[in-house]
């Protein structure tokens, strides 16, 4: 971007380079050949986070109960409230407008990576020795029980929806 | 009080350069933009693009943006507005204004004429 | 571009007349309005900038109103001295634009 006529931190207008606003104020009037810009801090649900020649603030993001959110950090007069979601739940989206259910990994599947306030649950296909007989959103693929180490023999395969079955070895005569 | 004075007349062949100058005088000379502005013989005026001489900073007026090269000096407090490739359309008179909430002070013009 | 309609282009009136010019924006330009006077073979002068507020060493009987994009400048009484092609300027946004001009001339 090549410089322009104002400074950084400066706006034109009217052929003449006026501050902008500093982070957490907005604009009440431009300067004069005369005067500063005159600005006034926002109040205290608004915030503005950029150096600015906006004429109003920005309302807080309201972390609304009823959507599942709850505010994860409170806005101040220059950043916005931060929402994340209760417990269980994730955003739907980038922007956190709601929140759903954390998703359960079914049979056969287990978590790869538990859910978060803002990712849902990541689930993986139980891989050969690994079983998962439940829907959950949070047991991993468990492996199958070595019926060798218990000295027992393999009496019905495993699946990776159901663990080996063991038994007792048939004893030569 | 504020003065601008420009350059004298200038007779340019087309595909040429012109460089007109504009010297302040009665304020401080980086405390305020300097404007161009051009009028063809019988028009408006149209706005030609804007420089601070405190930064060297400027932006142009997109219709002539690859021609137009503004510059400010500020030793001698003078402003300089080149332009070219001159075509026949370019004839105008060139004016250059202090801002500062409007073009509040200009000069008496800069008439470029070009002719083959 | 942010055009600037001037009305009328031209107009003729006696000393003493009350004269009154238009300028239309297409979009909304706050007050960053402004008005120029070119009199043949004079430099130009800023009569009013900011819409309303009369630049120094002006006259008091020009005067300025309007916001947004409907502006009207006045010369309560015209005098001889007035005649001249009177532009309007917005300085909202770049480009900086011209309305056309009015030539106000003595009946």
């Known amino acids: 971007e090549p410089p322009t006529a104002c400074r950084e931190k400066q706006y034109l207008i009217n052929s003449q380079c006026c501050s902008l606003c500093q982070p957490g104020q907005k604009l009440v009037s431009d300067c004069t050949e005369f005067t500063e810009t005159e600005c006034l801090p926002c109040s205290e649900s608004e915030f503005l986070d950029t150096w600015n020649r906006e004429t109003r603030c920005h309302q807080h993001k309201y972390c609304d109960p009823n959507l599942g959110l709850r505010v994860q950090q409170k806005g101040t007069s220059e950043t916005d409230t931060i929402c994340t979601c209760e417990e269980g739940l994730h955003c739907m989206s980038e922007s956190c407008e709601s929140c759903v259910p954390h998703r359960s990994c079914l049979p056969g599947f287990g978590v790869k990576q538990i859910a978060t306030g803002v990712s849902d649950t990541i689930c993986e296909p139980c891989p050969v020795g690994f079983f998962s007989n439940v829907s959950s959103a949070f047991e991993k693929c468990r492996p199958w029980t070595s019926c060798e180490t218990k000295d027992l023999v393999v009496q019905q395969a495993g699946t990776n929806k159901t663990d080996v079955v063991c038994g007792p070895q048939d004893r030569q005569r | 009080q504020v003065q601008l004075v420009q350059s004298g007349a200038e007779v340019k062949k087309p595909g040429s350069s012109v460089k007109v100058s504009c010297k302040a005088s009665?304020?401080?000379?980086?405390?305020?933009?300097i404007e161009w502005v051009r009028q063809a013989p019988g028009q408006g005026l149209e706005w030609m693009g804007v420089i601070n001489p405190g930064s060297g900073g400027s932006n142009y007026n997109e219709k002539i943006k690859d021609r137009v090269t503004l510059t400010a000096d500020k030793s001698t407090s003078t402003a300089y507005m080149e332009l070219s490739s001159l075509r026949s359309e370019d004839t105008a008179v060139y004016y250059c204004a202090r801002g500062g909430g409007g073009f509040t002070y200009w000069g008496q013009g800069t008439l470029v004429t070009v002719s083959s | 571009d942010i055009q600037l309609t001037q009305s009328p282009s031209s107009l003729s009136a006696s000393v003493g007349d009350r004269v009154t010019i238009t300028c239309r924006a297409s979009q909304d330009i706050s007050n960053y309005l402004n008005w120029y006077q070119q009199k043949p073979g004079k430099t130009i002068k800023l009569l009013l900038n900011f819409a309303s507020r009369l630049h120094s060493g002006v006259p008091s009987r020009f005067s300025g109103s309007g916001s947004g994009t409907d502006f009207t400048f006045t010369i309560s009484s015209l005098q001889p001295e007035d005649i001249a092609t009177y532009y309007c300027?917005?300085?909202?946004?770049?480009?900086?634009?011209f309305g056309g001009g009015t030539k106000v001339e003595i009946k």
């Open positions: 300027q917005q300085g909202s946004t770049l480009p900086w634009t």
């Open positions: 009665g304020y401080a000379f980086s405390d305020y933009l």
